[in-house]
């Protein structure tokens, strides 16, 4: 079941998922000057069964002017630079990452993809937050948000994270642990 809204926004923080539950949609968005091809789904879908899940449909972008660039290749390094600074979209394809049953990994980039990925998450999905470059994480609890179903409506839990203007970015699960942070700080409900 799809979550009704997007995960909470935290000032100076971004979020990502370690893996995506079946039923998750990833919009096929293209960078400026390009648009989705006219045939094919407007999104990729995490689909499969308990033993194996994968992304169904492939996103393809074509030039808004000339309608001939529909190749699906990994972007060149200079194209990659246009991605978000944390490269959140492709970080999780790590060799040591354990595959979760009923989940998909981060899909690989497609040519001329937009800089930000737009996901439609499903109930039970967890996303993890980290502070952007130049900001340090202060925690009073987990820096994560879970989409939950309550009384027939979906809601995201509030991540217990605040990002202060210091130097080191915090890490996602599985990466090196950041410096200890003080407890007892208020929640942040502001947006990026």
């Amino acid at each position: 079941e799809l979550c009704d809204d997007d995960p909470p926004k935290i000032t100076h923080a971004t979020f990502k998922a370690v893996a995506y539950k079946e039923g998750t949609m990833l919009n096929c968005e293209c960078k400026r000057g390009f648009r989705r091809i006219k045939s094919g789904s407007p999104y990729m879908l995490c689909t499969g069964n308990s033993s194996h899940s994968s992304w169904d449909n492939q996103c393809q972008c074509t030039s808004s002017a000339a309608r001939n660039t529909t190749k699906q290749v990994t972007p060149q390094p200079e194209e990659q630079k246009e991605r978000k600074t944390t490269e959140m979209q492709s970080q999780m394809q790590l060799a040591d990452q354990v595959s979760l049953p009923g989940h998909c990994r981060e899909p690989p980039p497609w040519e001329n993809e937009a800089t930000e990925r737009i996901y439609h998450f499903v109930v039970g999905q967890t996303v993890y937050y980290q502070c952007v470059q130049g900001y340090r994480a202060l925690h009073r609890g987990p820096a994560e948000s879970v989409c939950k179903m309550t009384h027939g409506k979906t809601r995201w839990t509030q991540p217990q994270l605040i990002c202060t203007g210091e130097t080191e970015p915090s890490q996602f699960p599985g990466e090196e642990e950041p410096q200890a942070s003080p407890d007892g700080l208020p929640e942040s409900e502001t947006s990026r």
């Epitope: 809204d5 039923g23 949609m25 919009n27 648009r35 045939s39 094919g40 407007p42 999104y43 439609h120």
Partner: antibody, heavy 114, light 107 residues
Framework: QVQLQQSGAELVRPGTSVKMSCKAA????????IGWVKQRPGHDLEWIGD????????NYNEKFKGKATLTADTSSSTAYMNLSSLTSEDSAIYYC???????WGQGTLVTVSA | DILLTQSQKFMSTSVGDRVSVTCKAS??????VAWYQQKPGQSPKALIY???YRYSGVPDRFTGSGSGTDFTLTISNVQSEDLAEYFC?????????FGGGTKLEIK
């Protein structure tokens, strides 16, 4: 909670134009396409087109090119559809939709009558 | 344009029954099909996306199936509030198109 609030019913003369609105709330307006759908009694639902407010891209059903013009104002999180050279065939309920058709506005009834 | 045919314009059923609404596409649309419910005087409500995935808040008595050209919306244990018209839609290619609708009547 996601909401799409559409403007009220319109009674318009043949040959004129009408502009209806769809105000989005409860999600990031610039992240998702807004689509428009026409419904007339005794006819199939018809997809008119869609617009991406973030990049101001739009796609149109060939049938509605020249008839419908889609725009969006990101400052007010509002999408608009203008219908021109109206005839009785344009009398219908028009819906806006968002987030891959998951959410629909309440519809705007357009009646074209002399 | 891709044509979606809902061959049965009306279906009659009783509370507690199981009913299947079918939709046939004129060409392969993969699983890029959605189902909507529209009650009299209301906007369409999204039930199913990608042929078989339920939207949040949709009772689990609604299930979607199919791929390619043949799709089915099944309502098991029909309730009186299911009295409505049901539409399929393909979004595999522009222009997106809808089926003609199937009206469910409760005996």
């Amino acid at each position: 909670q996601v909401q799409l609030q559409q403007s009220g019913a319109e009674l318009v003369r043949p040959g004129t134009s009408v502009k209806m609105s769809c105000k989005a709330a409860g999600y990031t307006f610039t992240n998702y396409w807004i689509g428009w759908v026409k419904q007339r009694p005794g006819h199939d639902l018809e997809w008119i087109g869609d617009i991406h407010p973030g990049g101001d891209y739009s796609n149109y059903n060939e049938k509605f090119k020249g008839k419908a013009t889609l725009t969006a104002d990101t400052s007010s999180s509002t999408a608009y559809m203008n219908l021109s050279s109206l005839t009785s065939e344009d009398s219908a309920i028009y819906y806006c939709t968002s987030r891959n058709f998951a959410y629909w506005g309440q519809g705007t009834l357009v009646t074209v009558s002399a | 344009d891709i044509l979606l045919t809902q061959s049965q314009k009306f279906m009659s059923t009783s509370v507690g029954d199981r009913v299947s609404v079918t939709c046939k596409a004129s060409q392969n649309v993969g699983t890029n099909v959605a189902w909507y419910q529209q009650k009299p005087g209301q906007s369409p409500k999204a039930l199913i996306y990608s042929a078989s995935y339920r939207y949040s808040g949709v009772p689990d008595r609604f299930t979607g199936s199919g791929s390619g050209t043949d799709f089915t919306l099944t309502i098991s244990n029909v309730q009186s509030e299911d009295l409505a018209e049901y539409f399929c839609q393909q979004y595999n290619s522009y222009p997106y198109t809808f089926g003609g609708g199937t009206k469910l009547e409760i005996k």
